[in-house]
């Protein structure tokens, strides 16, 4: 399987699929009301967590959980039956130009967002990377300025498609820049829909 | 909440709701031809308003409203039942470097494309951001240019996600900057389209 | 902004939703397709591996998708470019980026831009260097039209399963 | 193996035009900018300007802007330099180049004279 | 207009002798956000397109001989050939990629002593 996808910025993919999880702890007996029995479906809203960056929301503003699909912190999202998903994700980064001087190369940020699968057949062990984008930021620096920081700059790296989903797989968000993350309403976001 | 989002041009937040509609006219009583009966969707197309900046065509090219959705200049996109909608939005930009000189800060533009509901529940003077997309752009400035413009730059701000919606509320898209919006086909679009 | 804070009552009007059921059939026309990452120079898409599909009548010719019957399809594309370090030799001038999903069908004599993105990066500015653009959309589509993409930096894809691909399913 | 191949030089008249091709092979044409520069007999080098073939996109030294105007077929991987009111001093060899690869094609020769 | 200044504007040399050109651009090359310098050197027989050597100051271009190097950084660039060889006899351009018009030096002819 394709684990490797884009240049990440820790070594241990297993590590780094891990270390990029951070969602919000629900406990899976109490899966969020059911408004459409009939249509497996989720949207969960990027929230921050304290000490991992980046969590998830599952009943604040227009986040919820449809119809048996759950949601822990520890194994990402499961949906509740066999089908042909729709998964999507976006998340909205934002930082500032570090002072003048310094490496330029220290300057450039490439901001990568990922979806992953694991559980089921692929094992607890084996996150496979089904979806991801990617954003090289490089703020422009103003020469002059040898102290302070730059203006803030903002992008979005989003996506999404279709998979195949069976019951007990499990899917997740893993992102390369945790701190840069912007939870500002309507920006960072994760979902999926059963399509058939 | 957060409610900053990115800064804007305006500095009123309801005049700014509704400057950013721009949509075009069109009777409520006559939706498009119904190809689908049983799915509300829509797909609409970015066009140039005189005077607003963004407008949004229903009936040129690949563009459509289906199954009783609605739109108007005024109000936006109506949805003609309660559901869940996977809401999408895309609009592409262009832009000049401005001439050599000056402060890099200066020339920095984050362009914003925000997907809003109002009405319904949420009252006419409530609207609420739903999903939100950002990219700020530097055209990197040739320094020695007094004068004349750098090359074009293009890029483009999408997004989509699902939201459930019922009968009643409206949708529309503000962006931060109308005058910068690329009208190619294909380009700057939105739609909605119900999944449950 | 517009937005302001959820009213109070928010998170119950959500759950006060009548229920609704999608009735699902077994299969609907669905495909997803991933660029083949052993041509280098070009953008083929492929259908039979890495969790690539086709399902319920959409087929693939000549490097496009075969619409299989007539209504609505939500259509999306992604590609995601790349530049190496010190790529660019004599010249600072940007790098043109773009990719556009395109329907040719028996109404237009032409092909017509559906979905489309563009970038100008800087590759001698920043490296290296990563890009995407994604972009999804509904559409309504006719039995025998055809879905197909062009790319402008094919040189700088990456090419991989999760990176660059192409799909469409009816709603 | 990557070409560029200058084309449509010869002898015109003071006053007249010139069309000039640049046909591109063995690399992608799109998306890397097309420089014209001249060069006139026993002189240097002066650049003229630059197109994107992609988007459309062009950049033209002062000296020449309204008289040059730059264009591109990129379903024929060509690019093209149409120069007007041709004066004596516009004889030059005239170069198209790839400068984010580095290729230079040979060159065409126009002579302007009565 | 960034001006370039080339100098000498012609040299004789022997082959096997170490020649140094020298390019000065009216302002900087060096580009603050990555360091680095947007100057080329072209090399030019009669007859003949130039040919890419040197860019970003100092990279030698892909089957470039080695006895070629640049270096320099801000205005003042240096074109060395170490050991002059019977091919090397030809003209050679500096050019400024930092900032619209593209500029060249004049040229600096190299001839057989």
């Known amino acids: 399987q394709d684990q490797g996808g884009l240049v990440t910025e820790t070594a241990d993919p297993g590590a780094q699929a891990q270390q990029g999880l951070g969602f919000q702890k629900l406990p899976e007996e109490e899966p969020e009301t059911d408004l459409s029995p009939g249509l497996p479906a989720a949207h969960l809203i990027g929230a921050p967590l304290k000490g991992q960056g980046l969590g998830w929301e599952t009943t604040k503003e227009q986040a919820f959980l449809t119809s048996g699909t759950q949601f822990s912190d520890a194994e990402g999202l499961a949906l509740p039956q066999d089908g042909l998903y729709y998964l999507y994700c976006l998340v909205g980064y934002r930082g500032r130009a570090p002072p003048g001087g310094g490496d330029p190369q220290g300057r450039s940020v490439t901001l990568r967002s990922s979806l992953y699968r694991a559980g089921g057949a692929y094992g607890p062990g084996t996150p496979e990377l089904l979806l991801e984008g990617a954003e090289t930021v490089t703020p422009v620096l103003d020469p002059a300025r040898r102290q302070g920081y730059g203006p803030l700059w903002y992008t979005s790296v989003g996506f999404g498609g279709l998979v195949q989903l069976r019951r007990g797989e499990r899917v997740y968000v893993n992102i390369s820049h945790p701190d840069m993350v912007d939870f500002a309403r309507g920006k960072t976001f994760f979902g999926a829909v059963m399509v058939g | 909440q957060d409610q900053g989002g990115l800064v804007t041009e305006t500095a009123d937040p309801g005049a700014q709701a509704q400057q950013g509609l721009g949509f075009q006219k069109l009777p409520e009583e006559e939706p498009e031809t119904d190809l689908s009966p049983g799915l509300p969707a829509a797909h609409l197309i970015g066009a140039p308003l005189k005077g607003q900046g963004l407008g949004w065509e229903t009936t040129k090219e690949q563009a459509f409203l289906t199954s009783g959705t609605q739109f108007s200049d005024a109000e936006g996109l109506a949805l003609p039942q309660d559901g869940l909608y996977y809401l999408y939005c895309l609009v592409g930009y262009r832009g000049r470097a401005p001439p050599g000189g000056g402060d890099p800060q200066g020339r920095s533009v984050t362009l914003r494309s925000s997907l809003y509901r109002a009405g319904g529940a949420y009252g006419p003077g409530t609207p609420e951001l739903l999903l939100e997309g950002a990219e700020t752009v530097t055209p990197v400035l040739d320094p020695a240019r007094r004068q004349g413009y750098g090359p074009l730059w293009y890029t483009s701000v999408g997004f989509g996600g699902l939201v459930q919606l019922r009968r009643g509320e409206r949708v529309y898209v503000n962006i931060s900057h109308p005058d910068m919006v690329d009208f190619a086909r294909g380009k700057t679009f939105f739609g909605a389209v119900m999944v449950g | 902004l517009p937005g302001v804070g959820l009213t109070p009552s928010a998170a119950q009007t959500a759950r006060q939703h009548p229920k609704m059921h999608l009735a699902h059939s077994t299969l609907k026309p669905a495909a997803h397709l991933i660029g083949d990452p052993s041509k280098q120079n070009s953008l083929l898409w492929r259908a039979n591996t890495d969790r690539a599909f086709l399902q319920d009548g959409f087929s693939l010719s000549n490097n496009s998708l075969l619409v299989p019957t007539s209504g609505i399809y939500f259509v999306y594309s992604q590609v995601v470019f790349s530049g190496k370090a010190y790529s660019p030799k004599a010249t600072s001038s940007p790098l043109y980026l773009a990719h556009e999903v395109q329907l040719f069908s028996s109404q237009y004599p032409f092909h017509v831009p559906l979905l489309s993105s563009q970038k100008m990066v800087y590759p001698g500015l920043q490296e290296p260097w990563l890009h995407s653009m994604y972009h999804g959309a509904a559409f309504q589509l006719t039995q025998g039209d055809q879905l197909s993409t062009h790319t402008d930096g094919i040189p700088h894809l990456v090419l991989s399963p999760s990176t660059v691909f192409f799909g469409a399913f009816a709603l | 193996e990557v070409q560029l191949v200058e084309s449509g030089g010869g002898l015109v008249q003071p006053g007249g035009s010139l069309r000039l091709s640049c046909a591109a092979s063995?690399?992608?044409?799109?998306?890397?900018?097309i420089e014209w520069v001249r060069q006139a007999p026993g002189k240097g080098l002066e650049w003229v300007g630059e197109?994107?073939?992609?988007?459309?996109?062009?950049i033209y030294n002062e000296k020449f802007k309204g008289r040059a105007t730059f264009s591109a077929d990129n379903s024929k991987n060509t690019a093209y330099l149409q120069m007007n009111s041709l004066r004596a001093e516009d004889t030059a060899v005239y170069y198209c180049?790839?400068?984010?690869?580095?290729?230079w094609g040979q060159g065409t020769l126009v002579t302007v004279s009565s | 207009d960034i001006q370039m200044t080339q100098s000498p504007s012609s040299l004789s040399a022997s082959v096997g002798d170490r020649v140094t050109i020298t390019c000065k651009s009216s302002q900087s090359l060096l580009y603050s956000t990555n360091q680095k310098n947007f100057l080329a050197w072209y090399q030019q027989k009669p007859g003949k397109a130039p040919k890419l050597l040197i860019y970003w100051a100092s990279t030698r271009d892909s089957g470039v001989p080695s006895r070629f190097s640049g270096s320099g950084s801000g205005t003042d660039f240096t074109l060395t050939i170490s050991s002059l060889q019977p091919e090397d006899f030809a003209t050679y351009y500096c050019?400024?990629?930092?900032?619209?018009?593209?500029?060249f030096g004049q040229g600096t002819k190299v001839e057989i002593k």
């Open positions: 197109i994107n073939p992609g988007s459309g996109s062009t």
């Open positions: 180049a790839d400068g984010y690869h580095g290729y």
């Open positions: 063995g690399y992608t044409f799109s998306s890397y900018w």
């Open positions: 050019q400024q990629y930092y900032s619209y018009p593209r500029t």
